[in-house]
């Protein structure tokens, strides 16, 4: 069974950094592109970033470009999101996800809450 | 960025009645692989999102056949033929044809009492 479990969320001050992790199991992690999607409290979904199966390509939403870095460790079946220069507007539940665009099934984690506040 | 505009933003529906949600994109969503990558998601209260439809009209396995997607180019529609209580939630369209991917604002479906 496919499982995605995010961790690393918490309360952080503006301008500081935080690293989120997503532990994947139940599928061949090294064969899949992986995404981060976020949802601010009471708001809609915002796609954040994608990384290719082998880590070779990465794309970002304009709102996080230059501040966030998506990465992966295929030997550990883990996806990461390094967030720096955090702003209040980055406050959201962050989800990792697989197969947003194609394939017969998509998979999402339960999300981890990041609160940026002084 | 491609702007995705959903309407209506709120949709009260009577149980058993049909529902229709529109999604318009600011650019064509036909990708270089020849497919149109417009996706619909459902997010029930307190849950993670789940994909209902991919490539405009392909239902994800396990999704009831009362859900259907249609459209082309820049105009797309999600239809629910007979709304059930479990359909309550927010529905989002997503374009996967241009970087960065972008979601619509969401349409909140609720049951009329």
């Amino acid at each position: 069974q496919v499982h995605l479990v995010e961790s690393g969320g918490g309360v952080v001050q503006p301008g500081r950094s935080l690293r989120l992790s997503c532990a994947a199991s139940g599928f061949k992690f090294r064969s899949y592109g992986m995404h981060w999607v976020r949802q601010a409290p009471g708001k809609g979904l915002e796609w954040v970033a994608i990384i290719w199966y082998d880590g070779s390509k990465r794309y970002y939403a304009d709102s996080v470009k230059g501040r966030f870095t998506i990465s992966r460790d295929n030997s550990k079946n883990t996806l990461y999101l390094q967030m720096s220069s955090l702003r209040a507007e980055d406050t959201a539940v962050y989800y990792c996800a697989r197969d947003l665009i194609t394939g017969t099934t998509d998979y999402w984690g339960q999300g981890t809450l990041v609160t940026v506040s002084s | 960025d491609v702007v995705m505009t959903q309407s209506p933003l709120s949709l009260p529906v009577t149980l058993g009645q049909p529902a229709s949600i529109s999604c318009r994109s600011s650019r064509s969503l036909v990708y270089s692989d020849g497919n149109t990558h417009l996706i619909w998601f459902q997010q029930r209260p307190g849950q993670s999102p789940r994909r209902l439809i991919y490539r405009v009209s392909n239902r994800v396995s396990g999704v009831p056949d009362r859900f259907s997607g249609s459209g082309s180019g820049t105009d797309f529609t999600l239809k629910i033929s007979r709304v059930e209580a479990e359909d309550v939630g927010v529905y989002y369209c997503l374009q996967g044809a241009h970087w960065p991917y972008t979601f619509g604002q969401g349409t909140k479906l609720e049951i009329k009492r």
């Epitope: 496919v2 061949k28 290719w52 390509k57 947003l100 194609t102 | 692989d33």
Partner: antibody
Framework: DVQLQESGPGLVKPSQSLSLTCSVT?????????WNWIRQFPGNKLEWMGY???????NYNPSLKNRISITRDTSKNQFFLKLNSVTTEDTATYYC?????????????????WGQGTSVTVSS | DILLTQSPGSLAVSLGQRATISCKAS??????????MSWYQQKPGQPPKLLIY???NLESGTPARFSGSGSGTDFTLNIHPVEEEDAATYYC?????????FGGGTKLEIK
Amino acid sequence: DVQLQESGPGLVKPSQSLSLTCSVTGYSITSSYYWNWIRQFPGNKLEWMGYIMYDGNNNYNPSLKNRISITRDTSKNQFFLKLNSVTTEDTATYYCARNMADYFGNTYDALDYWGQGTSVTVSS
Amino acid sequence: DILLTQSPGSLAVSLGQRATISCKASQSADYGGDSYMSWYQQKPGQPPKLLIYAASNLESGTPARFSGSGSGTDFTLNIHPVEEEDAATYYCQQGNEDPWTFGGGTKLEIK
């Protein structure tokens, strides 16, 4: 369009090393993908030998692990196969190939672009 | 290693008829609901050509008369209706587990 072309000696003596080159045009081998070597023995049996990734990391068939090395020259957009201590059993047609990936970051561990192959005979 | 056994070793099919090739794996080629099984066509003097990936997905340029099915340990390639240009040897290949392995091939002749 992506093209791969194998080259190397057609005849190698037993116990020596076999060295082959795969020249890639139309795509940078440092951008993405797995760059593979596969061989086909007389009688047509196919064997996956290993690959080098865009970042230089390797994955080899365990049956060849102590004899095989796949390296690259990024400036020439080439990758190489070196097989040590060859025997007549290594006589085969050697292909280089690229794995396939879709537009959305997924791979299916299949091989979509192949070279034409180069025939290697191991004989004294 | 996962051993792939193809059957039949060769078959002769009349033009317009159906050709069915089986590939049986010694262990599952599935992981997390996905089938890492591909099919290739090889003509004399040419490299193998990818036809189908992930058990049933047609590679770009593969004619619709080719179809793949199956999961777990049992996979099938169907060609219908067979055309003259389909005369070739067909191979299955699994990528679920290292090392990637190929079937022994099935030679298709047109009657």
